[in-house]
Structure formats: C-alpha cells, structure tokens
C-alpha cells in the first residue's frame, strides 16, 4: 500500500508512517514502527505537557517567585502548568503573570469603581457631583456629600469632588 501523506487525529506522520501522539502528561521517547507503538514516558516531578504531543522534553512548571510578589494560585500537574497570582495588595503586570506591581490608589477626587484583584488593577472613577473623596486609597469609593438638611443645618461651604460640604446652623435672623 501507498505510504500515508496525512494521519488521523492524535497521530503524526514520521518517515511515511502514522504514529500515535503522546497523551498529555507524557513525552515522546521513540517514534513508532510498523511493529511497535509510540514510546512515551510520563513527565517528571515539576514538569508538564498539556496537549497530545511529540515533544521529547516536558516543560518546566512556572516558578512563582516570591521576590517578584508572586505566589502559587494553583499547583501544576503533569498535564497543567502552575498558575501564579500576586500577594495581597499586588496584581499581575501581564496575562502570563510573570511579575507583580502594587495596586494603584485612587487620588483625591476619584473613588474606587472596582477593587483590584490578583490579576487586575484598581479601576478609579471621578467623583460625580454630589460625591467626594479626600484620600488616596485603593479601597475607598466616592462618598456622598453630607446632607445638611437632614441634620436641620444649612450648607455653609459647597462641596467639591475632593471635599465634603460644610454644614452650619441655620441663620436665626430672618426678616
């Protein structure tokens, strides 16, 4: 019969022969022959392969370097890589999470719209009219201005996006 030019799924073509790929978690030791199946070996400790493959070397698990603010979120297996995340108060600089940076704080006049996670930074928003933030914070939302009326007081100084209103007693001398 004619040697194949293409192979089935989970097979590969080598020297005019279709051989089975190695399953995830195993590496290729030797190609198949007409008489012998593909030789595969399990990946070693701290190694993985996550696809059907013909790799002769397994990949090393990612190292979550504490010096870069990283910690293990999910331990790797022979079929999956280690997933790193950042220590509390830090977030990944990229999708691959190879290093961490400190969460951004929202400046006065801005409040936290979304608190940072291990993989995303703080999202800030400007305080709208009627709200303020007078601190630099990674957690504080914009606070509503104090309602002087509910305290039976009057506004003595208007609020801004950075300051609260100042309430004072009502003027008793009314015509």
């Amino acid at each position: 019969p004619e040697p194949p030019t293409a192979c089935r799924e989970k097979q590969y073509l080598i020297n005019s022969q279709c051989c089975s790929l190695c399953q995830p978690g195993q590496k290729l030791v030797s190609d198949c022959t007409e008489f012998t199946e593909t030789e595969c070996l399990p990946c070693g400790e701290s190694e993985f392969l996550d696809t059907w493959n013909r790799e002769t070397h397994c990949h090393q698990h990612k190292y979550c370097d504490p010096n870069l603010g990283l910690r293990v979120q999910q331990k790797g297996t022979s079929e999956t890589d280690t997933i790193c995340t950042c220590e509390e108060g830090w977030h990944c600089t990229s999708e691959a999470c190879e290093s961490c940076v400190l969460h951004r704080s929202c400046s006065p006049g801005f409040g936290v719209k979304q608190i940072a996670t291990g993989v995303s930074d703080t999202i800030c928003e400007p305080c709208p009219v009627g709200f303020f933030s007078n601190v630099s914070s990674a957690f504080e939302k914009c606070h509503p201005w104090t309602s002087c009326e509910t305290k039976d007081l009057v506004v003595q100084q208007a609020g801004t996006n950075k300051t609260d209103v100042v309430c004072g007693p009502q003027d008793r001398l009314r015509a």
Partner: antibody, heavy 117, light 109 residues
Framework: QVQLVESGGGVVQPGRSLRLSCAAS????????MHWVRQAPGKGLEWVAV????????YYADSVKGRFTISRDNSKNTLYLQMNSLRAEDTAVYYC??????????WGQGTMVTVSS | EIVLTQSPGTLSLSPGERATLSCRAS???????LAWYQQKPGQAPRLLIY???SLATGIPDRFSGSGSGTDFTLTISRLEPEDFAVYYC??????????FGGGTKVEIK
C-alpha cells in the same frame, strides 16, 4: 530493570522440533514488537523473525520461512519461536530483541540450539 | 534485500588510537535507519548508534556515527581497552529481511 531472558534451547536431532521462549520484564511488553536474531558459532548475526506488538504482523527470513513460527502471549509477557523441521544449519545462539525506531535496543543473553544427530 | 558490506574485516589498533569502521549498503538506506552494535565474546550485542548518528542511551561519547544513503561510518575517537570487540551495522528501513553486515573485529595490535 528492563530484561529479556531466553530459554528452551538444547540439543535436538535434525527434523525434530523445539520451542524457544523469551520472558520480558521491566517494560510494557504489549506495546513493543519483538525480534528473534541468531548467530551460528563463529559467525555473524542473522535476523530470523519479527512480530508486531499485538501479534497480527509477522515476517520471517527466507531461510526459516514455513518451518519457524513466531508468536507471543502478552498476558504472560512472553515471546516464542516454534522451530520445526530443524536442520544442522539452524545451529546457533538465538537471541530475542526489542523492536524500536532506534533499532534493537534491548537483547536477551541468548539460548543455544544445537541440531545434531 | 539490502546487503551491507563492512570493512575492514579486522582492525588491529592500540589503545588510545582512533578506529574508523565502514558499512556500505547495496542500495540507499531510507531515513538513515542504520544502527551499529557492539558484541563481546559470550555476550549479546549492544546498541551503540541508531539513525546513523544518534548515540544510544548510556554509550560513551567517544563513539560516533555518520553517513547517509549508502555509506556509513562508525568512529571510536580514542580506543579504550573495553572497546576491543566485534562491531555490526544493521539496516531497519527496508524489510523483510532486517539485514546485518558481516562485522568488523577490532583487536589489540
């Protein structure tokens, strides 16, 4: 460790039969093709037969075709060579060897077959 | 059938010398499916080189293989006392039969 051990050799008269065995250990026998190779006293290596991992494909050297039969029992991790109508020229050390795309990577220590009247 | 011819039949050398063994095929060996084996008296053959040039597991790097098509060479860069033995080439690309060369004996001079 990976090992092949042949047995069943001996002295036999011409025209008689003998069955050689090769016991495998230390590897997944059912995944590998297996060969028999022989070596007459003071001579070189001669390939005899091969069988595929599941036993469906078998090839023989012309010198033994129709007289020798290669077989295997994967449940017993054992390879066999049934030798019928033996001749003086079949006198040799018989080795079993493991098939890979790297050649015959593991060999047994051999078993001696002497065909003599 | 691919016929393999090895030369020389015998090579007389001293320890420390370089050994060059030749294996010539009667027709091209596809995919360089050619192996070299070492055999010492009373022992089974041992795989040294596969795919014409790849070193088998556990074999010292003083052994090397080269060649393609019909001409192949096994080189031992510096002979050690334990290297004196018979060496066989074998093709496993075109079968049946899997053929061996007649062997080269490397002996102490």
């Amino acid at each position: 460790q990976v090992q092949l051990v042949e047995s069943g050799g001996g002295v036999v008269q011409p025209g008689r039969s003998l069955r050689l065995s090769c016991a495998a250990s230390g590897f997944t026998f059912e995944k590998y093709g297996m060969h028999w190779v022989r070596q007459a006293p003071g001579k070189g290596l001669e390939w005899v037969a091969v069988i595929s991992y599941e036993g469906t494909k078998k090839y023989y050297a012309d010198s033994v075709k129709g007289r020798f039969t290669i077989s295997r029992d994967n449940s017993k991790n054992t390879l066999y060579l049934q030798m019928n109508s033996l001749r003086a020229e079949d006198t040799a050390v018989y080795y079993c060897a493991r098939d890979t795309s790297r050649g015959h990577d593991i060999w047994g220590q051999g078993t001696m077959v002497t065909v003599s009247s | 059938e691919i016929v393999l011819t090895q030369s020389p039949g015998t090579l007389s050398l001293s320890p420390g010398e370089r050994a060059t063994l030749s294996c010539r095929a009667s027709q091209s060996v596809s995919y360089s499916y050619l192996a070299w084996y070492q055999q010492k008296p009373g022992q089974a053959p041992r795989l040294l080189i596969y795919g014409a040039s790849s070193l088998a597991t556990g074999i010292p790097d003083r052994f090397s293989g080269s060649g393609s098509g019909t001409d192949f060479t096994l080189t031992i860069s510096r002979l050690e006392p334990e290297d004196f033995a018979v060496y066989y080439c074998q093709q496993y690309s075109d079968y049946p039969p899997f053929t061996f060369g007649g062997g080269t004996k490397v002996e102490i001079k």
